[in-house]
């Protein structure tokens, strides 16, 4: 699925829905992109409690385990994003996989991801002839990480 | 910076370089998007050795520390991506912050990120009038995570 770029318009870039295909179908095909988190969602039940599993996906085997929460917006590209939610305040012991170790904190790793929103074009709300894709940075939590607590100087 | 979508073209979507502005400036303004990794690059010297710091950014305080490596393609949106490179094979001890604990593995968390490539439109290489933005999934390592080794059933 691709955007086709053509010279001769007054804004960069200017894009057009297809005549041949139903725009909702086409828009969703283009916007859906990846609809899976880094680790398979089918396995995330492993990680719904504060323990480090010895099997399953990475988010459940981590000593800073997390689950994925879906963030869906049909007017965004990509339409589905996943936020990591830490299941423990502290890291789980490597020995037991269940007891928490107060020496380590389980914290989310945030990232400003590039996304695009479908919007009415500025000053053209009434025409319904055009829409704009607006680039934005959107904060997502990618994973949870076991860190040593910050020591202030 | 936004894409302007307009009805009436034969492909979805069809986009136009600006007449008013220098195309390289405009294209890169749109494609550059976020040019920073989740943690500030200026601090990543903290994490260039296999140890967990007590200060600095998250990637250097993690007991599975990592550094960020730039992946740049001017024909991609976003043009700059960052890959996490694990600095230790095992997790660093929470007690010492330096000795490795063989009970835990430091492993990269991979994610298929949505990106767009600027390409000649199919069958139009000779016209010099259009280019296409092609959606792809691109594998990046987001972070390194301390996990309990997988135990096979």
């Amino acid at each position: 699925v691709s955007l086709r770029i053509q010279e001769g318009c007054s804004h960069l870039p200017s894009c057009c829905p297809s005549k041949e295909q139903e725009p909702p179908e086409e828009w969703l095909k283009w916007s859906s992109a990846s609809v899976s988190p880094p680790e398979p969602l089918s396995h995330t039940h492993h990680a719904e409690s504060c323990r480090a599993s010895k099997d399953g996906p990475l988010n459940s085997r981590a000593i800073s385990p997390w689950s994925y929460e879906l963030d869906r917006d049909l007017n965004r590209v990509p339409q589905d994003l996943y936020h990591a939610r830490c299941l423990c305040p502290h890291c789980v012991s490597l020995q037991t996989g269940s007891h928490m170790d107060p020496l380590g904190n389980s914290v989310p790793l945030y990232h400003n991801q590039t996304v695009f929103y479908r919007r009415p074009c500025h000053g053209e709300e009434g025409t319904h002839r055009r829409y704009c894709l607006e680039r934005r940075l959107y904060r997502v939590s990618l994973a949870c990480v076991c860190v040593r607590p910050r020591v202030m100087a | 910076v936004s894409l302007r979508i307009q009805e009436g073209c034969s492909h979805l979507p069809s986009c136009c370089p600006s007449k008013e502005q220098e195309p390289p400036e405009e294209w890169l303004k749109w494609s550059s998007a976020s040019v920073s990794p989740p943690e500030p690059l200026s601090h990543t010297h903290h994490a260039e050795s296999c140890r967990a710091s007590k200060d600095g950014p998250l990637n250097s305080r993690a007991i599975s520390p990592w550094s960020y490596e730039l992946d740049r393609d001017l024909n991609r949106v976003p043009q700059d991506l960052y890959h996490a490179r694990c600095l230790c094979p095992h997790c660093v001890s929470l007690q010492t912050g330096s000795h490795m604990d063989p009970l835990g593995n430091s492993v990269p968390l991979y994610h298929n990120q949505t990106v767009f490539y600027r390409r000649p439109c199919h069958g139009e290489e000779g016209t010099h009038r259009r280019y296409c933005l092609e959606r792809r999934l691109y594998r990046v390592s987001l972070a390194c995570v301390c996990v309990r080794p997988r135990v096979m059933a």
């Epitope: - | 890169l28 490596e69 390409r119 000649p120 280019y131």
Partner: antibody, heavy 125, light 108 residues
């Protein structure tokens, strides 16, 4: 008209630091998408890419030589510099600087579209 | 890191003969670039993005390929085509420019 010209010491001894300068005109290295790289060629051998610097000061180095290379730029004087630490006889070569930054309708080309004439460097004790 | 292997390393061709120079990448790449270099001169860009001829390059030259296999073809060899040809690619991660070892083309 785009021109690039390399300059260097000509001859230096092993373990010394090689300093090269590329003076260019006809384009600005502050233009988005523009970059300038260094390539070397030992006599009778092939081309070897060494380093690259972009308009936004992002730098790339050949991984095997990264610890010895430093690339930098001075926009005001339209110059790019390359230093190679601890040179050896294997660093004897003709050193070229070359520009990258050609935008076509389909995107940027990663080819070096303009080259300097090269400067010969001999490392000898 | 991707390695480019050119073949043959040296070849000779008679005037009017068709010539094909190959460039093989160790893993799949999107595009290939080609340069021509004559003794005592700097390399000149010859083919952009696999198949686009640089300005001033005669139409008897063409480029093609995809994936790991690319080639430069001269439909009818001429004396002025005698030179060394290099293939080159850019890899975004880690960001590196890589050259093939070169093919020296001589006129018979």
């Amino acid at each position: 008209q785009v021109t690039l010209k390399e300059s260097g010491p000509g001859i230096l001894q092993p373990s010394q630091t090689l300093s090269l300068t590329c003076s260019f005109s006809g384009f600005s290295l502050s233009t988005s998408g523009m970059g300038l790289g260094w390539i070397r060629q030992p006599s009778g051998k092939g081309l070897e890419w060494l380093a690259h610097i972009w308009w936004d000061d992002v730098k790339h180095y050949k991984p095997a030589l990264k610890s010895r290379l430093t690339i930098s730029k001075d926009i005001s004087s339209s110059q790019v510099f390359l230093t190679i630490a601890s040179v050896d006889t294997a660093d004897t070569a003709t050193y070229y600087c070359a520009r990258m930054g050609q935008l076509h309708y389909y995107g940027y080309d990663y080819a070096m579209d303009y080259w300097g004439q090269g400067t010969s460097v001999t490392v000898s004790s | 890191q991707i390695v480019l292997t050119q073949s043959p390393a040296i070849m000779s061709a008679s005037p009017g003969e068709k010539v094909t120079i190959s460039c093989s990448a160790s893993s799949s790449v999107s595009y290939m670039y080609w340069y021509q270099q004559k003794p005592g001169s700097s390399p000149k860009p010859w083919i952009y993005r696999t198949s686009n001829l640089a300005s001033g390059v005669p139409a008897r030259f063409s480029g093609s390929g995809s994936g790991t296999s690319y080639s430069l073809t001269i439909s009818s060899m001429e004396a002025e085509d005698a030179a060394t040809y290099y293939c080159q690619l850019y890899h975004s991660y880690p960001p590196t420019w890589t050259f093939g070892g070169g093919t020296k083309l001589e006129i018979k």
